[in-house]
Amino acid sequence: DAEFGHDSGFEVRHQKLVFFAEDVGSNKGAIIGLMVGGVV
């Protein structure tokens, strides 16, 4: 079962490669240091 998060990357979990496709519809701050939205 693929598990999707907001990072583009892989994580080894129980020897399974899981792809974290970037969710472009989300402004969660997956990119380190990229200003997202306004001040909240």
Partner: antibody
Framework: EVQLQQSGAELVEPGASVKLSCTGS????????VHWLKQLTEQGLEWIGR????????IYTPKFQDKATLTVDTSSNTAYLQLSSLTSEDAAVYYC?????WGQGTTLTVSS | DIVMTQSAFSNPVTLGTSASISCRSS???????????LYWYLQKPGQPPQLLIY???NLASGVPDRFTSSGSGTDFTLKISRVEAEDVGVYYC????????FGGGTKLEIK
Amino acid sequence: EVQLQQSGAELVEPGASVKLSCTGSGFNIKVYYVHWLKQLTEQGLEWIGRIDPENGETIYTPKFQDKATLTVDTSSNTAYLQLSSLTSEDAAVYYCVSSGYWGQGTTLTVSS
Amino acid sequence: DIVMTQSAFSNPVTLGTSASISCRSSKSLLHRNGITYLYWYLQKPGQPPQLLIYQMSNLASGVPDRFTSSGSGTDFTLKISRVEAEDVGVYYCAQNLELWTFGGGTKLEIK
């Protein structure tokens, strides 16, 4: 002023644990992922992992899976990085980052 | 792990001229979705790093357009036109195709 304020420098004995904090001011830490990075020298950055404060979901670099624990206390608007079983290799500057905001860094010294 | 390789020092540059900093990845950072997951950060002396470029060619907010990035899937170049004194620092490339890894950093030297 919007900022992430990190806790002060730490001097810790080998084998012990330490919990570093990162507090948002003028900024709701719950909204965006909090990333943590390790800088061994001025030239060298490692990504430890990140936490989604909304649900506590974490992702770690495999190297730090057994070393680091990321948590968030939304009531105090604070993210934490706990490091266990400290050795001299853990001595570094640690940064938290959320959205476009960086903490000033916390220097960890491991020495007996 | 994807390994990001940079030379430790740039060729010394004269203020007002252009500088280029290179970076190589051990695996193509071009995803099938068309995005190249390559980033550039600058760490000025005594400060945390700051994001300059994201996903190979996008300028982060507040970054002057003197900074441009180009490359293929594995070889990348950050070009700084009209170098200013405030550009001095260590430049890191990074990838997040597979989690995040950073290059060792390239120190920009002024003549």
